[in-house]
């Protein structure tokens, strides 16, 4: 029961996490740009992995895609790749984990197969979560190191007057969504891996079979009713796996006057 709950919870947590990773990847608010002393008008800029948007004080919003690949920083391309890999792995993991769920019966699938599938999906979720966390962290690092406080000195012409305009880059909502979603996917993956241990069928413990050579005692095998005496090849408490063998715990048969052949 606990295994089923752990597996089910892992699946749900991973599902929420992957939905979050997809949402973060599609969101436009990865970074926001503010001008400290904007000399023109109140305009708010924010950027995602795929396009840049502007929102005016009037409420007008317009977005424009990054149509060039060559002009984009390599880091941005890396972040895109990490997020897409995370989504793809997560989606495959979800597909695998649906069939691995203990509560879902598909044909005559054995527990060992479900255990393997659960482990596979768990590993996929872990890698997916790590990809998302890595992608978001790389982007955040790119903002902090390259763009955080960009100061531009511009001449206004006559007199050589200079105005310094500072652009402040701040973390957008998508970064936090990505971090949380990646964490959830990671946790879900760990839960699936834990559930896998409980699903995996352990080796069956067969009790040792002992034969006592007491008089003319006979062990009866149901298959064809062929009798074997206690003095045969199985005298050393070997495990035998046919239904005719009786263990020490069972009631011993007493010697009878007749041997049934």
């Amino acid at each position: 029961m606990a295994v089923t709950a752990c597996q089910g919870l892992g699946f749900v947590v991973s599902l929420i996490g992957i939905a979050g990773i997809i949402a973060a990847t599609c969101m436009d608010q990865w970074s926001t740009q503010d001008l400290y002393n904007n000399p023109v008008t109140a305009v708010f800029n924010y950027q995602g992995l795929w396009r840049s948007c502007v929102r005016e004080s009037s409420g007008f919003t317009e977005c424009r895609g990054y149509f060039t690949l060559l002009g984009l920083p390599a880091m941005l391309q890396a972040v895109r790749a990490l997020m897409i890999v995370g989504i793809v792995l997560g989606a495959i993991g979800l597909l695998v984990s649906i069939f691995a769920l203990k509560c879902i019966r598909i044909g005559s699938m054995e527990d060992s197969a479900k255990a393997n599938m659960t482990l596979t999906s768990g590993i996929m979720f872990i890698v997916s979560g790590l990809c998302a966390i890595a992608g978001v962290s790389v982007f955040a690092n790119m903002l902090v190191t390259n763009f955080w406080m960009s100061t531009a000195n511009m001449y206004t012409g006559m007199g050589g007057m200079v105005q310094t305009v500072q652009t402040r880059y701040t973390f957008g909502a998508a970064l936090f969504v990505g971090w949380v979603a990646g964490g959830l996917t990671l946790i879900g993956g760990v839960m699936m891996c834990i559930a896998c241990r409980g699903l995996a069928p352990e080796e069956t413990n067969y009790k040792a079979v002992s034969y006592h050579a007491s008089g003319h005692s006979v062990a009866y095998k149901p298959g064809g009713f062929k009798a074997s005496t206690g003095f045969g090849s199985n005298t050393k408490n070997k495990k035998i796996y046919d239904g005719g063998a009786r263990t020490e715990d069972e009631v011993q048969s007493y010697p009878s006057k007749h041997d049934y052949v």
Epitope: S52, V54, L76
Partner: nanobody, 122 residues
Framework: QVQLVESGGGLVQPGGSLRLSCAAS????????MGWYRQAPGKQRELVAA????????NYADSVKGRFTISRDNAKNTVYLQMNSLKPEDTAVYYC???????????????WGQGTLVTVSS
Amino acid sequence: QVQLVESGGGLVQPGGSLRLSCAASGSIFSINAMGWYRQAPGKQRELVAAITFGGGSTNYADSVKGRFTISRDNAKNTVYLQMNSLKPEDTAVYYCNADLLVGGFPRRNVYWGQGTLVTVSS
């Protein structure tokens, strides 16, 4: 690199008209807003008019309201300032200002033109 090229300044009689234009060129991703500032000799620089390129919201200094009109041409990345009923106190160097996003993964910066002189005198 981004360049702002201003034109249209000159000498005009009081009550006359002038049309200033400012064209932005270079590695521009998009334009947030453009505007005109002016600086008369011995005075502080002041905003004359500004316009956002997306929605076309405008902002005017009280001293020019009703006389000056700012407009933009998105396709040409150009802003225009139509100045009517000019007064001697409008004499100043007029500077173009542009709030731009520049580059492939755009960075926001404010750029200034070199200025064009407008003289209102009889």
